[in-house]
């Protein structure tokens, strides 16, 4: 029962996480205009992975897509790639985990197969969550780098008479959605891996035991129940302890110019 609950909860948490990763990827507010120096701006700028937008006080919002692939910064491309890989892995993981759910019966699928599928989906969720967290973190790092770069030369002009205020960008809502969603997917994946341990059969080796039955004696030797009479090879509700989650290579991020509008 606890295994089913853990698996079910892991699935639901991962589902919410992946929905969040998809939402974050599609959102336009990855970076938003920093209003510290001009809190009463009549024009508000914000940017996403796919387009940049301008919202006026009038209510008019204009968005322009980045209609170039080669002209975009490598770091932005990397973030896009990480988020897409996260979504794809998460989607495949969801598909696999649906068939792996203990509460769903599909033909005569053995528990060992369900355990393997649960572990596979769990690992996929973990990698998916890591991809999302890495993607969002790389973007956040780009923002921080550019924020201080633009702060350094915030005001330019002719003898200080005319001020040209450079637009600075800060963390947008999508970053927080991405971090939370990535974390949820990661947690869901770990829960699936834990559930996997409770699903699979356990090949247990027993010490030799002698039974003195009426009429004759039978000696049970180590090596399991495969050849023993009366017990058969019923592996239901036995546990297998598998190594669980594998560690992924760490994603290294480097400061980059975030200036793609």
């Amino acid at each position: 029962m606890a295994v089913t609950a853990c698996q079910g909860l892991g699935f639901v948490v991962s589902l919410i996480g992946i929905a969040g990763i998809i939402a974050a990827t599609c959102m336009d507010q990855w970076s938003t205009q920093d209003l510290y120096n001009n809190p009463v701006t009549a024009v508000f700028n914000y940017q996403g992975l796919w387009r940049s937008c301008v919202r006026e006080s009038s209510g008019f919002t204009e968005c322009r897509g980045y209609f170039t692939l080669l002209g975009l910064p490598a770091m932005l491309q990397a973030v896009r790639a990480l988020m897409i890989v996260g979504i794809v892995l998460g989607a495949i993981g969801l598909l696999v985990s649906i068939f792996a759910l203990k509460c769903i019966r599909i033909g005569s699928m053995e528990d060992s197969a369900k355990a393997n599928m649960t572990l596979t989906s769990g690992i996929m969720f973990i990698v998916s969550g890591l991809c999302a967290i890495a993607g969002v973190s790389v973007f956040a790092n780009m923002l921080v780098t550019n924020f201080w770069m633009s702060t350094a030369n915030m005001y330019t002009g002719m003898g200080g008479m005319v001020q040209t205020v450079q637009t600075r960008y800060t963390f947008g809502a999508a970053l927080f959605v991405g971090w939370v969603a990535g974390g949820l997917t990661l947690i869901g994946g770990v829960m699936m891996c834990i559930a996997c341990r409770g699903l699979a059969p356990e090949e247990t080796n027993y010490k030799a035991v002698s039974y003195h039955a009426s009429g004759h004696s039978v000696a049970y030797k180590p090596g399991g129940f495969k050849a023993s009479t009366g017990f058969g090879s019923n592996t239901k509700n036995k546990k297998i302890y598998d190594g669980g989650a594998r560690t992924e290579d760490e994603v290294q991020s480097y400061p980059s110019k975030h200036d793609y509008v």
Epitope: Q33, N38, V40, T41, A42, V43, N45, Y46, Q47, S52, C53, V54, E56, S57, S58, G59, F60, E62, R64, V162, Q163, T164, V165, Q166, T167, V261
Partner: antibody, heavy 118, light 113 residues
Framework: EVMLVESGGGLVQPGGSRKLSCAAS????????MAWVRQAPGKGPEWVAF????????YYVDTVTGRFTISRENAKDTLYLEMSSLRSEDTALYYC???????????WGQGTSVTVSS | DIVMTQSPSSLTVTAGEKVTMTCKSS????????????LTWYQQKPGQPPKLLIY???TRESGVPDRFTGSGSGTDFTLTITSVQAEDLAVYYC?????????FGSGTKLELK
């Protein structure tokens, strides 16, 4: 046809209060931000206040902050400007205007005159 | 606050003449997000409210004759009337539409010789 009609102007004592109204017609009032602009005799226009279509974004010029309150009633297609602690420098023709793309005021009323004098 | 400075304060012209008036802002009105200049021009005739002529520095409002042309970027802007007509005699105001408070220039009065 877009129409904006201001009312509520008149002679007010210094320190007194007044509430201006602007009745809108000919467009979907709740889709647009609105503004009040005033023009003192022989002077240029001065933007006074702005309210967005859903009334959650409001801005005032520094000289009226704390004294004037802009509000709107979308159900009645009406814009208001509540003025208190009036001063002689608030004497002007008060226009209400529709705010649109480009943060511009594309339609203006004919204005209502407010005179602050003892 | 952004200060808008208009020059000249008045212009005396003859019908058919080309007229140019300028407007300078104390801060750039160019928005990097959409590369648009938030500078607006209004025309005000005596006894009437201001009328919108040009927004985004160069976009003509519908119904405005094409003899009115707006140009400029950043902090320096120009309104040009290619062939002045009698009905163009008015005061022209530029306005910052980029940042609150939405400040107006002091105006350029167009008069007939």
């Amino acid at each position: 046809e877009v129409m904006l009609v201001e009312s509520g102007g008149g002679l007010v004592q210094p320190g007194g209060s007044r509430k201006l109204s602007c009745a809108a017609s000919g467009f979907t009032f709740s889709d647009y931000g609105m503004a009040w602009v005033r023009q003192a005799p022989g002077k240029g226009p001065e933007w006074v206040a702005f309210i967005n279509n859903l009334a959650y974004s409001i801005y005032y010029v520094d000289t009226v902050t704390g004294r004037f309150t802009i509000s709107r009633e979308n159900a009645k297609d009406t814009l208001y400007l509540e003025m208190s602690s009036l001063r002689s420098e608030d004497t002007a023709l008060y226009y209400c205007a529709r705010f649109t793309t480009g943060n511009v005021m594309d339609y203006w009323g004919q204005g209502t005159s407010v005179t602050v004098s003892s | 606050d952004i200060v808008m400075t208009q020059s000249p304060s008045s212009l005396t012209v003859t019908a058919g003449e080309k007229v140019t008036m300028t407007c300078k802002s104390s801060q750039s009105l160019l928005n990097g997000g959409n590369q648009k200049n938030y500078l607006t021009w209004y025309q005000q005739k005596p006894g009437q409210p201001p009328k919108l002529l040009i927004y985004w520095s160069s976009t003509r409002e519908s119904g405005v004759p094409d003899r009115f042309t707006g140009s400029g970027s950043g902090t320096d802007f120009t309104l040009t009337i290619t062939s002045v007509q009698a009905e163009d005699l008015a005061v022209y105001y530029c306005q910052n539409s980029y940042s609150y408070p939405l400040t107006f220039g002091s105006g350029t009065k167009l008069e007939l010789k």
